[in-house]
Interface confidence: low
């Protein structure tokens, strides 16, 4: 659409009165790189116009660079220069007479997003039918509105639920928090993949991603590299890791010659079987049994420990 300006030069009313009421609103950010235009248009094109901001009272004059006035556009100024002000107006001097535009109320809007955090952030594993809950938290400066956008493998999912809300932050704080929660009630194999949450404030977008792994059903198995024979010399520390694949993580139990091993100051029987100072009597067959906590499926593996006396 083209705009035609017809100048009716009126030295008693150099600023074009807005059809709206007695004041306007200008929205600004404190971004150092942004300028704002105060739309005090002129009926005379070659006026000497300054911008008055209050409170405290400050006057800005065109500097031929980032501060300028154009009768068809208004007064342009870096927004951070008037971010302190409650109101601004344009002023023209004609024959020692001062003429003022309408008042413009200054409303500072934020834009900075400090970070976007996904929770859980990594290592998400589920089996088919389980519920996936992902929280995306954006921390921003004050006076920011946030739009969340999620990208994930089956974005058309019928069972997904998205809830966005503002989190309460301390009154003395320099930041706001926004939370978006993605819930998929019963995941399928097609829900496996990369989940990305993007938060946008209009001027800035930040995003974060995490990988979700979906298993057909709970399972447990020994991983490759699980040793069958371990050799050691008296006095050494022996570590026998239980290398497994499984979801959810299995319960691990160690046995020696069929007798359950309990952890004490000389032996630690957990994800890794550790014998602090191995002795001749530690020689024997060690069995590790992995139990899936959901399906109760069990897998066992025998490791022979041979201890040499130097």
């Amino acid at each position: 659409a083209s705009v035609i300006y017809v100048y009716v030069q009126d030295y008693r009313s150099p600023f074009i009165a807005s059809v709206s009421d007695q004041h306007g609103v200008v929205y600004i950010t404190e971004n150092k790189n942004k300028t704002v235009v105060i739309p005090c248009l002129g009926s005379i094109s070659n006026l000497n116009v300054s911008l008055c901001a209050r409170y405290p009272e400050k006057r800005f004059v065109p500097d031929g660079n980032r501060i300028s006035w154009d009768s068809k556009k208004g007064f342009t100024i870096p927004s951070y220069m008037i971010s302190y002000a409650g109101m601004v107006f344009c002023e023209a001097k004609i024959n020692d007479e001062s003429y003022q535009s309408i008042m413009y109320i200054v409303v500072v809007v934020g834009y900075r997003i400090y970070d976007v955090v996904l929770s859980p952030s990594h290592g998400i594993e589920l089996s088919v039918g389980e519920k996936l809950v992902l929280n995306c938290t954006a921390r921003t400066e004050l006076n920011v509105g946030i739009d969340f956008n999620w990208e994930y493998p089956s974005s058309k999912h019928q069972h997904k639920k998205l809830v966005n809300r503002d989190l309460k932050t301390q009154s003395g704080s320099e930041m706001k928090k926004f939370l978006s929660t993605l819930t998929i009630d019963g995941v399928t194999r097609s829900d496996q993949g990369l989940y990305t949450c993007a938060a946008s404030s209009g001027l800035m977008t930040k995003k974060n991603s995490t990988f979700v792994r979906v298993h057909e059903k709970p399972f447990v198995a020994f991983g490759s590299g699980m040793e069958s024979l371990v050799e050691a010399t008296v006095g050494e520390r022996v570590r026998i890791p239980a290398k497994y694949l499984g979801y959810p993580p299995p319960e691990i139990k160690w046995y020696k010659n069929g007798i359950p091993l309990e952890s004490n100051h000389t032996i630690k029987a957990g994800h890794v079987l550790t014998i602090m100072e191995v002795s001749e009597r530690d020689t024997g067959n060690y069995t590790v049994i992995l139990t899936n906590p959901i399906s109760k499926e069990k897998q066992s593996h025998v490791v022979s420990l041979v201890v040499y006396v130097p």
Partner: antibody, heavy 117, light 107 residues
């Protein structure tokens, strides 16, 4: 070394004015909310005013609204408190304090303001 | 306004004693509560923020707990240098308010 140093206190008559200053050093002043807190002789702490990093938000306690003005100059790492129409009950040590997201973590040593005829 | 009621207003204890101060908020302030120590003639010093987090460099004998409206500040083993007035402060809402203070003395 993070430091806040107040100045500008003194003796003033009721109805008079004073301007307190707080000079900051050792940290990025323009990134923090700044606060004024006062303590009347023998009394507890009372929050007076806060100003956010870019001066976009300013808050006052009810008893000083319309009389006190908090401001800052980030280019000079300075915080100010313009106090007008002073009353006897404004007599106190005035502290400036840095506001982190959670607390007032750095305090100045304070400047004494006495309002008396 | 959120009122902060601190008790006791003063207390006397012996070196090595466990000392407890309580602070009650007139409204739910989640965990936006801080504890400060002020020694005579000095500025206040932050000890604990967010109800229970120890400020860097503060001895571990100081601790804080609580959420909502009821909060507790504890010195596990009182030392002579702990003689001071202690204040709680809420940062949940404007106006920011402090408790009336607890003056701690050595028996």
């Amino acid at each position: 070394q993070v430091n806040l140093r107040e100045s500008g206190g003194g003796l003033v008559k009721p109805g008079g004015s004073l301007r307190l200053s707080c000079a900051a050093s050792g940290f990025t002043f323009g990134s923090y909310t700044m606060n004024w807190v006062r303590q009347a002789p023998g009394k507890g702490l009372e929050w007076v005013a806060s100003i956010t990093s870019g001066s976009s938000y300013i808050f006052y306690t009810d008893s000083v609204k319309g009389r006190f003005t908090i401001s800052r100059d980030n280019s000079r790492s300075s915080l100010f408190l313009q106090m007008n129409s002073l009353r006897a009950e404004d007599t106190a040590i005035y502290y400036c304090a840095r506001g982190s997201a959670s607390a007032f973590d750095i305090w100045g040593q304070g400047t004494m303001v006495t309002v008396s005829s | 306004d959120i009122q902060m009621t601190q008790s006791p207003s003063s207390l006397s204890a012996s070196v090595g004693d466990r000392v407890t101060i309580t602070c009650k908020a007139s409204d739910d302030i989640i965990n936006y509560l801080n504890w400060y120590q002020q020694k005579p003639g000095e500025a206040p010093k932050l000890l604990i923020y967010d109800a229970s987090i120890l400020e860097t460099g503060v001895p571990s004998r100081f601790s804080g707990s609580g959420s909502g409206t009821d909060f507790t500040f504890t010195i596990s083993s009182l030392q002579p240098e702990d003689i001071a007035t202690y204040y709680c402060q809420q940062l949940d809402d404007i106006p920011i308010t402090f408790g009336g203070g607890t003056k701690l003395e050595i028996k």
